[in-house]
Interface confidence: medium
């Protein structure tokens, strides 16, 4: 009897196992989140596990299926969209991925009133983008780069644009560079709040140089993929914004919205469009040299049927220390008076904070302040402003949701999430219903993610939407690594790091160290989020210590850190990784003869430069799909941080910051270079040039290409990639297989 508990304890110990690579590749420990598809203040739709589309009413507690899985399956639908008048549902099938956000699909319209698919005037296929109007059931869609409008799903379409042409003119959808680097969407059209007007962008890529690469496929001859892709300093797309009255589209046709004079005087970008009312719209523009942004509020002139953007309604945002905004220029959230708005930008101390703009930016009232940053404004109601920040307990890698009450005196700030599930949840996002009557909180960690539903007035939790119970149970017998988030203070710079430690970690022993780096401008790697991934496996099973470090150039810690890399990419990001490694060695538990670094994309660039730094710190390293020269990467992204590759601007640093320039320094490290041949984003050209420079310098290295794979190296390539990298690291660290 006395021995039994101890036996049970031992058997529990024995059943605990380390993570395996198979666990990671199979997604055994992946988690679920629950984002309600809000359709009113108190109702949302959700696709159930068995694929029924279910409507939930929070106030009545009732739910009912609006679309059965049978109907979904009849057209092999993988997605759906309910019209705001609740009469129709579009069903999306034949999903075909294009770039990061874009895809084409076939669309069917299902009539909920009679339970039949709409016949007659069916939609063409494949469609590039389709959406309902915000009120009623008008449809706008993009087909073959032109925009079409239907007043009702069964009506014949009205063609709005006629000049659309593949790889030349894009209407209502972005070209490659706008999709990836500016809009971060698959669409470039926006309905006004009540569906009266439709605004859209036209991108003219006629003069843009084309990137061409082979797609090998299965045919006798490879296909050539051609993408208009402006690299740094090249000719950019020309953008125009039009608005059409959807009630009488043929009456005056699309009307162009004027570009502010100070923007139009040289190369520029359109960065976003925000409708304020049906007859007021806000456009944001950006100079090609991306330190000046102009927000322009335009009004519909009934008498002339045109859009007027008075100079008095132009608001300029300028950075003197870096580029405008963070990764993107922030977008405004308008107040109920339809003219004043809330916006996040740098305060006088160089921290991004919420400001309220009534007349001019100079007279902006600062709403939040402190040595932390406001990150997102979720919703402004008459009484409350909801936002996220990393203020709580001074951890930049956390996200909590706050409410500022603006409907009572004195205005008060309340952290909605800080103490809800403090150990489990420190990184939140939120999704609000109309008028913020209710909201969902999605917690990403550091514990197992959980999604909950809350009352928008009282903040009370109403119910758990998803708590990942199965995952929790599955992890009960897994020896997960330990994680800690701490900071190093070095030369007035704070370097936050996350360290992932083997389960039986003992400070008196020596462990191999792997640095995982991204390090791109305005990124953040050290976050309080849950993950069971490849590096978790390396710590759990292979006994490695893994560290992630946020150095100069990273986000949410103020402009001093963020803009430190301005016009000097590839210098401080690398320095700070090296500095951190030296500090880790000083901690006493790192085997300094077994240190590696790896990264993907920007991280591949940083890891390559770190390996070639000549410090002798790194034994080996891996670069996956790295940038190798900023002259090879996209104009919008590169020039934001580097300026132009011209003699009178920043050509010298473009040349100095290449991986190829350091080819000789790879002689004393083991280097594994990996790239997909069909990478539309960081072109294979980057790795081809590294390989050529290494060969010319007679430096030995290892390489792997993935035929016809893009920047994500997905599918079976993922398994092959992580297996290959695991073997490489184990060999480097002299770990037995």
């Amino acid at each position: 009897i006395v021995l039994r508990p101890s036996r049970v304890h031992n058997s529990e110990e024995n059943t605990m196992r380390a993570l395996t690579l198979k666990d990671i590749l199979n997604g055994t420990f992946s988690y679920k989140t629950f984002f309600p598809n809000w359709i009113s203040g108190q109702e949302y739709l959700h696709q159930s596990a068995d694929n029924n589309i279910v409507l939930y009413n929070i106030e009545t507690g009732q739910s009912y299926t609006i679309l059965s899985n049978r109907t979904m399956k009849s057209v092999n639908a993988s997605n759906y969209g309910l019209s705001p008048d609740r009469q129709f549902v579009y069903l999306e099938s034949d999903y075909s991925k294009l770039w990061r956000y874009s895809y084409t699909a076939t669309y069917y319209i299902y009539d909920l009133s009679n339970g039949e698919f709409v016949r007659g005037n069916e939609l063409p296929r494949p469609i590039q983008y389709l959406c309902w109007s915000p009120v009623g059931s008008k449809l706008a869609y993009v087909y073959q780069n032109n925009i079409y409008l239907k007043q009702r799903p069964g009506d014949p379409p009205f063609q709005i644009t006629f000049n659309g042409r593949e790889n030349k003119i894009f209407n209502g959808i972005p070209d490659w560079v706008y999709e990836e680097e500016m809009l971060a969407t698959k669409y470039a059209l926006w309905w006004s709040p009540n569906g009266k007007f439709l605004a859209y962008a036209e991108f003219n890529d006629t003069d843009i140089p084309v990137i061409a690469y082979s797609y090998y496929g299965d045919e006798q001859y490879p296909r050539t993929i051609n993408i208009p892709y402006p690299k740094a300093g090249a000719k950019n797309p020309v953008v125009r914004i039009f608005i059409i009255d959807t009630t009488y589209p043929a009456y005056v046709g699309p009307q162009e919205v004027p570009v502010p004079a100070m923007i139009a005087s040289s190369d520029y970008y359109f960065s976003w469009l925000t409708w304020v009312t049906d007859e007021r719209v806000c456009l944001q523009w950006l100079k090609r040299v991306q330190n000046v942004s102009v927000l322009s509020i335009c009004d519909f002139r009934e008498d002339w049927q045109t859009w007027d953007c008075p100079k008095t309604q132009e608001h300029i945002e300028e950075s003197r220390t870096g580029w405008a905004g963070g990764f993107f220029v922030s977008t405004p959230v308008f107040s109920y008076d339809a003219i004043s708005y809330y916006k996040i930008f740098s305060d006088k101390d160089g921290y991004k904070h919420i400001h309220y703009i009534k007349d001019t930016v100079e007279n902006a009232i600062q709403i939040t302040s402190g040595k932390w940053e406001a990150i997102n404004i979720f919703r402004v109601t008459q009484d409350s402003l909801f936002y996220s920040s990393n203020e709580f307990e001074e951890y930049p890698g956390r996200r909590n949701i706050y409410r500022i009450s603006i409907g009572s005196y004195p205005p008060s700030k309340k952290c909605v999430t800080c103490h809800l599930r403090k150990e489990r949840c420190q990184y939140y996002t939120a999704s609000f219903s109309d008028y913020a009557k209710y909201y969902a909180l999605v917690c990403y960690g550091p514990g197992i993610p959980i999604s909950t539903l809350h009352d928008g007035r009282t903040d009370q939790e109403i119910k758990i939407l998803e708590e990942n119970k199965e995952l929790e149970n599955a992890l009960k017998n897994i020896q997960l690594p330990k994680e800690e988030i701490k900071k190093l203070e070095v030369d007035e710079i704070t370097l936050w790091y996350k360290m992932i430690l083997p389960p039986q970690f003992d400070r008196s022993k020596k462990y191999p160290l792997l640095i995982q780096v991204y390090g791109g401008p305005c990124s953040q790697s050290v976050r309080s989020v849950f993950a069971v991934n490849w590096i978790s496996y390396l710590a759990s099973k292979e006994g490695m210590v893994i560290a992630l470090v946020d150095g100069r150039g990273t986000a949410f810690q103020g402009d001093k850190l963020l803009y430190a890399v301005y016009r000097k990419l590839g210098v401080y990001e690398v320095e700070d990784q090296i500095t951190a490694v030296r500090k880790f060695i000083e901690m006493g538990f790192i085997d300094e003869k077994r240190i590696a670094i790896w990264g993907w994309s920007y991280g591949g660039y940083v890891s390559s430069l770190a390996l070639a730094s000549g410090t002798g710190l790194f034994k080996c390293g891996i670069a996956v799909a790295p940038v190798s020269s900023w002259e090879y990467y996209a104009s919008v992204y590169t020039e934001r941080f580097m300026g132009l590759p011209t003699k009178d601007d920043n050509l010298e640093h473009y040349k100095n910051s290449t991986v190829m320039a350091r080819a000789e320094y790879f002689r004393n490290v083991d280097y594994l270079l990996i790239h997909g041949t069909a990478d539309d984003n960081v072109h294979f050209q980057n790795s081809a040039q590294i390989a050529k420079a290494l060969v010319n310098a007679q430096v030995d290295f290892q390489a792997m290409w993935y035929s016809d794979q893009n920047h994500g190296l997905s599918g079976l390539s993922t398994n092959h990639l992580y297996t290959h990298m695991t073997h490489f690291l184990k060999q480097c660290f002299s770990l037995s297989d």
Epitope: S335, D337, S340, I365, I367, G407, S408, Y409, P411
Partner: nanobody, 118 residues
């Protein structure tokens, strides 16, 4: 242009009452919190009452709590300050104010003099 016009000030004996009125024009009145401030000779401006845009929330400092009442009539675009049990220290110029945002008062009337003296 925003205009706030106060009326109702005057001379009153200690313990007496006065009702101040403020007529608002030139802005979207329903979106603004309103307040009454006062400034005694040689002193700074002090908030004595505030009311939210809907009228659902009011604020008073301890010095006037229970004696002053702020109210508003959104239809008439008026704000009122009922002052009871007045004391000599309530003597000041009273200003009507509208918030340009939250409780940042950016619009001011010309002021009306209130003198409490026997």
């Amino acid at each position: 242009e925003v205009q706030l016009v106060e009326s109702g000030g005057g001379l009153v004996q200690p313990g007496g009452s006065l009702r101040l009125s403020c007529a608002a024009s030139g802005f979207i009145y329903g979106y603004n919190h309103m307040g009454w401030f006062r400034q005694a000779p040689g002193k700074g401006r002090e908030l004595v009452a505030a009311i939210s845009r809907t009228g659902g929330s009011t604020y008073y400092p301890d010095s006037v709590e229970g004696r002053f009442t702020i109210s508003r009539d959104n239809a008439k675009r008026m704000v009122y300050l009922q002052m009871n049990s007045l004391r000599a220290e309530d003597t000041a110029v009273y200003y009507c104010a509208a918030a340009e945002f939250q409780w940042h008062f950016g619009y001011w009337g010309q002021g009306t003099q209130v003198t409490v003296s026997s």
